[in-house]
């Protein structure tokens, strides 16, 4: 069984200072661990590069909205 207690935690210590076009973005994940010093979003680009971004920035929030909408399936 994997040892969840010792599972590695990914943190972001610096954020990109450039706005990334949504056309270059494939997905995102949130860093929610209390072990990390900052709230953060990690975007994965279409070429599989991971980029740390500041969730307080409007372009980051808009990009997350855009990516969320792409997952929408009319199930309900």
């Amino acid at each position: 069984q994997p040892d969840a207690i010792n599972a590695p935690v990914t943190c972001c210590y610096n954020f990109t200072n450039r706005k990334i076009s949504v056309q270059r973005l494939a997905s995102y994940r949130r860093i929610t661990s209390s072990k990390c010093p900052k709230e953060a979003v990690i975007f994965k680009t279409i070429v599989a590069k991971e980029i740390c971004a500041d969730p307080k920035q409007k372009w980051v929030q808009d990009s997350m909205d855009h990516l969320d909408k792409q997952t929408q399936t009319p199930k309900t």
Partner: nanobody, 123 residues
Framework: EMQLVESGGGLVQAGGSLRLSCAAS????????MGWFRQAPEKEREFVAL????????FYSNSVKGRFTISRDNAKNTVYLQMNSLKPEDTAVYYC????????????????WGQGTQVTVSS
């Protein structure tokens, strides 16, 4: 951690209205997709409504579409659910949730949950 506290539930007659509120603290509220879910006795938790971060896009389950309205005030860190034309089948505990992970209406993409507020609709 993000804390979510719901309020506004209660007992109402069929055809009546209620407005639920969910106050958030501890994280950057405007960076989360917000949703409402509900769970009736002996039933599974079900999606009710969601609103995106900007507030410009809302999505509803077919069972509440046209009767319920979700909105948010990012300045007040609060999301609302206006419930009109309530029916006995709307009786449930209503939960507010913050969507941290990429997704839409799937409960698994919501990382933070409130304790819930009871809504009872009598006939």
């Amino acid at each position: 951690e993000m804390q979510l506290v719901e309020s506004g539930g209660g007992l109402v007659q069929a055809g009546g209205s209620l407005r639920l509120s969910c106050a958030a603290s501890g994280r950057t509220f405007s960076s989360y997709r917000m949703g409402w879910f509900r769970q009736a006795p002996e039933k599974e938790r079900e999606f009710v409504a969601l609103i995106n971060r900007s507030g410009g896009s809302q999505f509803y389950s077919n069972s509440v579409k046209g009767r319920f309205t979700i909105s948010r005030d990012n300045a007040k860190n609060t999301v609302y659910l206006q419930m009109n034309s309530l029916k006995p089948e709307d009786t449930a505990v209503y939960y507010c949730a913050a969507g941290a992970q990429m997704g839409w209406a799937e409960a698994s993409t919501y990382d933070y949950w409130g304790q819930g507020t009871q809504v009872t609709v009598s006939s």
